[in-house]
Interface confidence: low
Amino acid sequence: RWRQQWSGSGTTSRFPETVLARCVKYTEVHPEMRHVDCQSVWDAFKGAFISKYPCNITEEDYQPLVKLGTQTVPCNKTLLWSRIKDLAHQFTQVQRDMFTLEDMLLGYLADDLTWCGEFNTFEINYQSCPDWRKDCSNNPVSVFWKTVSRRFAETACGVVHVMLNGSRSKIFDKNSTFGSVEVHNLQPEKVQALEAWVIHGGREDSRDLCQDPTIKELESIISKRNIRFFCKNIYRPDKFLQCVKNPEDSSCLSGI
């Protein structure tokens, strides 16, 4: 039967099985979330987009799922990231008491997956899904990440850290999820400071990227929200990770 053709790739194959399996695995590895009923989680996830026009998804659609996946990160332990997901995840795998959104249940469930449905059918569209630029921004995947990112930022407290990619032309990009959602949803009454870690790409790059105009723009936005701002250059990300693993290493006493 005829399906609308979208510009983006279709739902990830075996999407329901993947979400359910990830949920079960997460609750096994994190006994604190054992109270979560994974079947209910999947039902709520499915309910957010199945049988709905995939360019008309709202944050409200995801509220039942968000409620089931309620989780709080201890103060000072939130790590945001922008355009440098792999290093952020490598870091939290080593520094086990810090958490990115993808270390939380809902982020873990959806990481690297694509999904969408069709209006008035109970089928998942495995052929194509709306592209954020070419089709529409209110698609199931984009709205999901906007919703959970907003919630993740809202619940952060203490000193919040963000990892930024110093190799990009816009180190801080106002159009990224971090720049458009998370920055604006940090709560000044709970968040004392935002500390940016600018990750350098080149081995010989000794510039102070904390002076970059986009970082200054970020500092301005944050300061206007009555949140203090700090910035650090991470000149050697490989050494940085090694020193997180083994802080006693003598070479870790020098700068990273």
Epitope: P31, V36, V73, P74, D97
Partner: antibody, heavy 120, light 111 residues
């Protein structure tokens, strides 16, 4: 610092109910599970279950399901355990206990214990 | 349910000696690289105190004379050398699967 303060000892008649409270302080109450553990005389320790105050989610040991009810009042940072249809084998010290949080699911903090004595 | 069997039930030793307490699980409590086995010490009239978590990691403030080892189904708590304040009841506990279960306890008494 983290503190869990439980209500005082109770003497209750067989067949009745008892509700033990556990007031938490020194941390964000809604961020951590509150567990309950039973220590019957000469019987060792038995896990009853836990509640996640953040969304009211509970998980019970099947053995206690139906007779134990775990609730939480987030405004008072207090967790409760109610046991109904009490019988003599429910005579025990009941502890509330908190784990270390995500990826740290072991009992780091304990209340002082509440002795419940079931009389006939 | 995963049954934890502790041995011995009672251990009589003198200060300065080595105490070895065993905990055997009815099935493996390993998951994703961790042994979900923890050890507690309990003294009369007090709540238990966490000693060792995830099989071998010492909890904050626990002296180095306490150590944990093991994986799969067999775990050991070792205390060496014994100090007078170490005489108490020791419990192992697993949380790999619901319901979380405790061993029957080992009473460590002064000889």
């Amino acid at each position: 610092q983290v503190q869990l303060v439980q209500s005082g000892a109770e003497v209750v008649k067989s067949g009745a109910s008892v509700k033990v409270s556990c007031k938490a302080s020194g941390y964000t109450f809604t961020s951590f599970n509150m567990h309950w553990v039973k220590e019957a005389p000469g019987q060792g320790l038995e896990w009853i279950g836990y509640i996640y105050p953040g969304n009211g989610g509970t998980n019970y040991n099947q053995k206690f399901q139906g007779r134990a009810t775990l609730t939480a009042d987030t405004s008072a940072s207090t967790a409760y355990m109610e046991i109904s249809s009490l019988r003599s084998e429910d005579t025990a010290v009941y502890f509330c206990a908190r784990t270390g949080g995500l990826r740290r699911a072991y009992f780091t903090y304990w209340g002082q214990g509440t002795l419940v004595t079931v009389s006939s | 349910d995963i049954v934890l069997t502790q041995s011995p039930a009672t251990l009589s030793l003198s200060p300065g000696e080595r105490a070895t307490i065993s905990c055997r699980a009815s099935e493996s409590v390993d998951s994703y690289g961790n042994g979900f086995m923890h050890w507690y010490q309990q003294k009369p009239g007090q709540p238990p105190r966490l000693l060792i978590y995830l099989a071998s990691s010492r909890a904050t403030g626990i002296p180095a004379r306490f150590s944990g080892s093991g994986s799969g189904t067999d775990f050991t708590l070792t205390i060496s050398p014994l100090e007078p304040e170490d005489f108490a009841v020791y419990y192992c506990q697993q949380n790999k699967e619901d319901p979380w279960t405790f061993g029957g306890g080992t009473k460590l008494e002064i000889k």
